[in-house]
């Protein structure tokens, strides 16, 4: 891993900061913060190289991949706020996360070495979280079928398709980060 | 929505205080808190935050290491203990309450704080 | 640190002309900041959280955008009322700064 140095948001364009922030006071958010940033990169890069840079709705639809999403009933919200629910249930969805980015390291076509960053350090987010749950048997494993049917739809022939489901991943990913730092902040 | 600070006053340089903030009208044990000044025709700094739970804490460079940010949740009230204060110091203190996105929803009426000899 | 710089630092409006307010930082932050009014002798009041959304009770003719390190508050149709004091923040990385401050004048 590369050593510690600047946080993400300390430079002029955090996306591009390339140490882990690991001597921070609070390491699950200055990691989440690492992690963002990365993503942020990879999302620009999609859409300078490959012109893949609105959100596509229907083709989020169609993919079937069932993404995690953070809802009312997993306790992360201000409203019905209960914080080993959330922390169980924002584990579960990186866990489920990580095998989707598994797959996308391996069928990435640009900076394979942000996309590992991304994949590696939640990873390591997983693993603090993970101390942090007091029951880890509610950590559930996911479904390797979703696993399939994503390999299937990044090695298809069909580059926009591809790349959408790419850029969908990554988004999803960045939408479930930004509300588990709101999360994580609040406790 | 009700936040009520008090404890303001003047203090000397070196010196110290604690400021309160009492909250009313929702579910303090809910929300996050911050404290925010202004010192005399300047603008707005933000000093400290902390989460429902004080498992979250985090101070402005400026004040970190003199003030202390914490919180009663049985008695719905916010504190800011200061020491080691300078002229720097002088200002209107506000508490705020902080919604999701950590955005200041709810603010108290201020209590001012002169750091002088 | 990140730094958050806000333009103009004061203007002067008419009611019923439309204004933006700009609030530049030093790096990305990701959606995460608020504009705030104050008026003289009060308390700040949240407008606009989350780079976009418009806070509970707040007219429609405020409006925020912007996205990375680019963010700005729209008022159209100013109104008397609206004139005093706005300030932009953010709450990426520690601190959580605010901006300069524009003051908003009558002409």
């Known amino acids: 891993f590369p050593t510690p140095g600047p946080l993400a948001g300390d430079s002029k364009d955090d996306a591009t900061s390339n140490s882990l922030p690991l001597t921070s006071a609070n390491k699950v958010e200055e990691l989440i913060k690492y992690i963002l940033g990365k993503i942020s990169a990879l999302r620009k890069e999609m859409c300078d190289k490959f012109n893949k840079c609105e959100d596509s709705k229907e083709a989020l639809a169609e993919n079937n991949l069932h993404l995690p999403k953070l809802e009312g009933k997993d306790g992360c919200f201000q409203s019905g706020f209960n914080q080993e629910t959330c922390l169980t249930r924002i584990t579960t969805g990186l866990v489920e996360f990580q095998l989707h980015l598994n797959i996308l390291q391996n069928n990435y076509e640009g900076d394979k070495e942000n996309v590992k960053s991304v994949h590696m350090s939640t990873k390591i987010l997983v693993q603090m979280l993970k101390s942090k749950v007091k029951n880890q048997d509610e950590v559930t494993t996911p479904d390797p079928t979703t696993d399939a049917s994503l390999q299937a739809i990044l090695q298809s022939q069909d580059e926009c398709v591809k790349h959408t489901t790419i850029h969908l991943i990554l988004r999803s990913l960045e939408d479930f980060l930004q509300f588990s730092l709101r999360a994580v902040r609040i406790m | 929505v009700k936040l009520q600070e008090s404890g303001g006053g003047l203090v000397q340089p070196g010196g110290s205080r604690k400021l309160s903030c009492a909250a009313s009208?929702?579910?303090?044990?809910?929300?996050?808190m911050h404290w925010v000044r202004q010192a005399p025709e300047k603008g707005l700094e933000w000093v400290a935050y902390?989460?429902?739970?004080?498992?979250?804490?985090y101070y402005a460079d400026t004040v970190k290491g003199r003030f202390t940010i914490s919180r009663d949740n049985p008695k719905n009230t916010l504190f800011l203990q200061m020491t080691s204060l300078r002229s720097e110091d002088t200002a209107m203190y506000y508490c705020?309450?902080?919604?999701?996105?950590?955005?200041?929803?709810?603010w108290g009426q201020g209590t001012s704080v002169t750091v002088s000899s | 640190d990140i730094q958050l710089t806000q333009s103009p630092a004061s203007l002067s409006a008419s009611v019923g002309e439309t204004v933006t307010i700009t609030c530049r930082a030093s790096?990305?932050?990701?959606?995460?900041l608020a504009w705030y009014q104050q008026k003289q002798g009060k308390s700040p009041q949240l407008l606009v959280y989350n780079a976009e959304t418009l806070a509970d009770g707040v007219p429609s003719r405020f409006s925020g955008s912007g996205s990375g390190t680019q963010y700005s508050l729209k008022i159209n149709s100013l109104q008397p009322e609206d004139f005093g004091s706005y300030y932009c923040?953010?709450?990426?990385?520690?601190?959580?700064?605010f901006g300069g401050g524009t003051k908003l004048e009558i002409k």
């Open positions: 009208g929702f579910t303090f044990s809910r929300f996050g």
């Open positions: 923040q953010h709450f990426w990385s520690t601190p959580w700064t």
């Open positions: 705020a309450r902080s919604n999701w996105d950590g955005a200041m929803d709810y």
């Open positions: 790096g990305n932050i990701h959606n995460f």
């Open positions: 902390i989460g429902r739970g004080s498992s979250t804490i």
